[in-house]
Interface confidence: low
C-alpha cells in the first residue's frame, strides 16, 4: 500500500482488531452477536463462543435432543458442517463436558459480496454524490466502505501521487441511504471513487472514475410562473428562477430550455430562452397551457436537468389588437448584462412591450410608428457621432489603441471572451 494510504490502513487494522473479542475463541464478525456465517455447498465451521479454545464440547440443534457432534470428535470447540445447505441454517447450542452452556450460535448462509453497482451525479459544480446498490444478493448483512481520491499525477513518474490527492473517506448519508457526498470538488479534476461492499464472508470493490464536467446535471429551475398578457389572447409570459442548489457565481451560468403545449395536445413546442423569462406568442386562445423548463450548464457540461413541475396558464381573453409590422419588433431595449452577484437577471422580453400595441385606433398606431421612426433616426445619428469620436480618439493615442477606461462602463468585468450573453 502506498504511503498515502497509511492513514486509512491504520483505521482498517484498528477496526479489524476491535472485531476480534479477546474473551472468546471465536472471531466475531460484525453484525448481530452470536450469528456466524457460511456459504451454501461449502464446509462451515461453527465456533462455541463461551469456552476456551480447544475445549471439547457437545453440539445440539436448538429444540432437538439429538446430539450432532460429541466432545470426543477431536474438533474441540468447533462444529464442522460439510456441504452446508438451507436446512443447516438455524440456532445451535454448545455444552461443555460438565453440562454447562457454552453458548448459542445462529448459522446464516449466504455469499461473499459481488462488486456493487455505483453511479455518481452532481447538481452543481462544487459537490457530487455517489450512490450504490448490490449487484447480486448475498443474503447476509452488508455494509459499504466509501472513499475517493483526486486523480492528479506528479511529473513523469506515474506512481508518485501528491498527498493532497487522498484517499479521503466519502461521507455517507447519516440516514442510511446508499449515498455519499464529496464536498468542495474541483470542476476540472478527475476523481476515483472506491465503493467496497463488505459482508462477513468477504469484500468486493468497485472503482469508478468521474469528472464533474461529465456528471453535472443541475436541479430543475424553480418558481416557474405562467401569466397571461392582458389584451393578447395568444400570449403567455413564463418566468422562473435558478435552482436553489446552484451556487451564485457569475462564471458558472445556466442556460434554459422551455416547453409548452395546450391542454390535451400530445406534442410539446420547445424554445431556448436567453434568460429567466420567455413570452410565448403562439399560444392557443382560450386554452390552458402547460409549461415546463429545464436547465443546463451554459457551456454544455453534463446533461440537461429533469423538467420542472409543470405550471399552467391560460391566455387572457379579449380582442386581438392589430399587430404592428414585423420591423417594429426590432425596436426593443438592449439586453441587460448579468451583474456579479446575480447569475442571470430577468431580461426584458424580446417581444414588443404589450402597452405599445394596446392601440384604440389607427391614428394612434401611425403616431407611434412615426415616433419610432424619429427615435431610430436619432439613434443612427448618435451612433455615427460616437463612431467618429471613437475613431478620433483612437488615432490620437500614441500606440493606436483606445485610451484607458474608454468603454469601460459598458464592458462588464466578469464577461469572458466568447462567453454567451445570458
Amino acid at each position: 500500500m502506498s504511503s498515502s494510504c497509511s492513514g486509512l490502513s491504520r483505521v482498517l487494522v484498528a477496526v479489524a482488531t476491535a472485531l476480534v473479542s479477546a474473551s472468546s475463541p471465536c472471531p466475531q464478525a460484525w453484525g448481530p452477536p452470536g450469528v456466524q456465517y457460511g456459504q451454501p455447498g461449502r464446509s462451515v465451521k461453527l465456533c462455541c463462543p463461551g469456552v476456551t479454545a480447544g475445549d471439547p464440547v457437545s453440539w445440539f440443534r436448538d429444540g432437538e435432543p439429538k446430539l450432532l457432534q460429541g466432545p470426543d470428535s477431536g474438533l474441540g470447540h468447533e462444529l464442522v458442517l460439510a456441504q452446508a445447505d438451507s436446512t443447516d441454517e438455524g440456532t445451535y447450542i454448545c455444552q461443555t463436558l460438565d453440562g454447562a452452556l457454552g453458548g448459542t450460535v445462529t448459522l446464516q448462509l449466504g455469499y461473499p459480496p459481488a462488486r456493487p453497482v455505483v453511479s455518481c451525479q452532481a447538481a452543481d459544480y462544487e459537490n457530487f454524490s455517489c450512490t450504490w446498490s448490490p449487484s447480486q444478493i448475498s443474503g447476509l448483512p452488508t455494509r459499504y466502505l466509501t472513499s475517493y481520491r483526486k486523480k492528479t499525477v506528479l511529473g513523469a513518474d506515474s506512481q508518485r501521487r501528491s498527498p493532497s490527492t487522498g484517499p479521503w473517506p466519502c461521507p455517507q448519508d447519516p440516514l442510511g441511504a446508499a449515498r455519499c457526498v464529496v464536498h468542495g470538488a474541483e470542476f476540472w479534476s478527475q476523481y476515483r471513487i472506491n465503493v467496497t461492499e463488505v459482508n462477513p464472508l468477504g469484500a468486493s470493490t468497485r472503482l469508478l472514475d468521474v469528472s464533474l464536467q461529465s456528471i453535472l446535471r443541475p436541479d430543475p429551475p424553480q418558481g416557474l410562473r405562467v401569466e397571461s398578457v392582458p389584451g393578447y389572447p395568444r400570449r403567455l409570459r413564463a418566468s422562473w428562477t435558478y435552482p436553489a442548489s446552484w451556487p451564485c457565481q457569475p462564471h458558472f451560468l445556466l442556460k434554459f430550455r422551455l416547453q409548452y403545449r395546450p391542454a390535451q395536445h400530445p406534442a410539446w413546442s420547445t424554445v431556448e430562452p436567453a434568460g429567466l423569462e420567455e413570452v410565448i406568442t403562439d399560444a392557443v386562445a382560450g386554452l390552458p397551457h402547460a409549461v415546463r423548463v429545464s436547465a443546463r450548464d451554459f457551456l454544455d457540461a453534463g446533461t440537461w436537468s429533469t423538467w420542472s413541475p409543470e405550471a399552467w396558464g391560460t391566455p387572457s381573453t379579449g380582442t386581438i389588437p392589430k399587430e404592428i409590422p414585423a420591423w417594429g419588433q426590432l425596436h426593443t431595449q438592449p439586453e441587460v448584462e448579468p451583474q456579479v452577484d446575480s447569475p442571470a437577471p430577468p431580461r426584458p422580453s424580446l417581444q414588443p412591450h404589450p402597452r405599445l400595441l394596446d392601440h384604440r385606433d389607427s391614428v394612434e398606431q401611425v403616431a407611434v410608428l412615426a415616433s419610432l421612426g424619429i427615435l431610430s433616426f436619432l439613434g443612427l445619428v448618435a451612433g455615427a457621432l460616437a463612431l467618429g469620436l471613437w475613431l478620433r480618439l483612437r488615432r490620437g493615442g500614441k500606440d493606436g489603441s483606445p485610451k484607458p477606461g474608454f468603454l469601460a462602463s459598458v464592458i462588464p468585468v466578469d464577461r469572458r471572451p466568447g462567453a454567451p450573453n445570458l
Epitope: 440456532t91 446464516q108 449466504g110 449487484s135 443474503g139
Partner: antibody, heavy 122, light 112 residues
C-alpha cells in the same frame, strides 16, 4: 404441506398505513426467506423485498424502501408487511411467497399465499 | 434493474399442441457462484402464481414432465410438449440473480 395464509382484502384511506400478514405453516418458518410481491392488473409482478425470519435481515427493492417495512413474529410463524402513506398507486394484490432451496442458494418463490387485495379509496 | 422480455405476449394453442415461450434478460443471469437463477411460474385466473421450473431447467415437485426449461446467459425457453386444459393461464419468467428480483410481463396461453 406448506401453507401461507393471507387475509382476502383490506380497504384503507389515502395517506393511511396498512399492516398485511402472512401466516406460515407446514415447514420450519425460520429456515426460509419470505418474499413479498405486488401485482396490479395489467402491470405484472413486482418484487418488494424479502426477510430472513431467523435473523430479521431484510433486502428491499430500492423502489419500495420507503413504502414497505418487513417484519416477522417467530412465535406465531407470521410475516408482516407495513405499507405507509398509501395512494391509489398502492391499490394492488400483495402476495407473500416462501423462498426455496435445493442445497444451494437461490430465492425463487416455491410457495405463494393467495394474496391480499389492498384498495386505497376515500 | 434487469429487464425480462417475454415473447409472445399471447399464445393461442389447441389442446395437444406443443407450446414454446421465450424469455430474454437485459444482462447475464449467471450468478458469481455459477448458478443461473431463472425461473418460470404459471398463474391461473383467480389464483396466485405457482412455481413450475427453477434454475432454468429444474422441475418443481409435482410439476408434470411435459414442462421443460432450457437456455443460458440471457436467452431462455419454456416448452410444453402437449398442452392440456389445466395448463392455460399466464406464464411469467423471473430472475433472482440480481437485485432487485424482476419478472417478465407474462405470456397468456389460451385456446385458439
Amino acid at each position: 404441506q406448506v401453507q401461507l395464509q393471507q387475509p382476502g382484502a383490506e380497504l384503507v384511506k389515502p395517506g393511511a398505513s396498512v399492516r398485511l400478514s402472512c401466516k406460515a405453516s407446514g415447514y420450519t418458518f425460520t429456515s426460509y426467506w419470505m418474499h413479498w410481491v405486488k401485482q396490479r392488473p395489467g402491470q405484472g409482478l413486482e418484487w418488494i423485498g424479502m426477510i430472513h425470519p431467523n435473523s430479521g435481515y431484510t433486502n428491499y427493492n430500492e423502489k419500495f424502501k420507503i413504502k414497505a417495512t418487513l417484519t416477522v413474529d417467530k412465535s406465531s410463524s407470521t410475516a408482516h408487511m407495513q405499507l405507509s402513506s398509501l395512494t391509489s398507486e398502492d391499490s394492488a394484490v400483495y402476495h407473500c411467497a416462501r423462498g426455496g432451496y435445493d442445497g444451494s442458494y437461490g430465492p425463487w418463490f416455491a410457495y405463494w399465499g393467495q394474496g391480499t387485495l389492498v384498495t386505497v379509496s376515500a | 434493474d434487469v429487464v425480462m422480455t417475454q415473447t409472445p405476449l399471447s399464445l393461442p394453442v389447441s389442446l395437444g399442441d406443443q407450446a414454446s415461450i421465450s424469455c430474454r434478460s437485459s444482462q447475464s443471469l449467471v450468478h458469481s457462484n455459477g448458478n443461473t437463477y431463472l425461473h418460470w411460474y404459471l398463474q391461473k385466473p383467480g389464483q396466485s402464481p405457482k412455481l413450475l421450473i427453477y434454475k432454468v431447467s429444474n422441475r418443481f415437485s409435482g410439476v408434470p414432465d411435459r414442462f421443460s426449461g432450457s437456455g443460458s446467459g440471457t436467452d431462455f425457453t419454456l416448452k410444453i410438449s402437449r398442452v392440456e386444459a389445466e395448463d392455460l393461464g399466464v406464464y411469467f419468467c423471473s430472475q433472482s440473480t440480481h437485485v432487485p428480483l424482476t419478472f417478465g410481463a407474462g405470456t397468456k396461453l389460451e385456446l385458439k
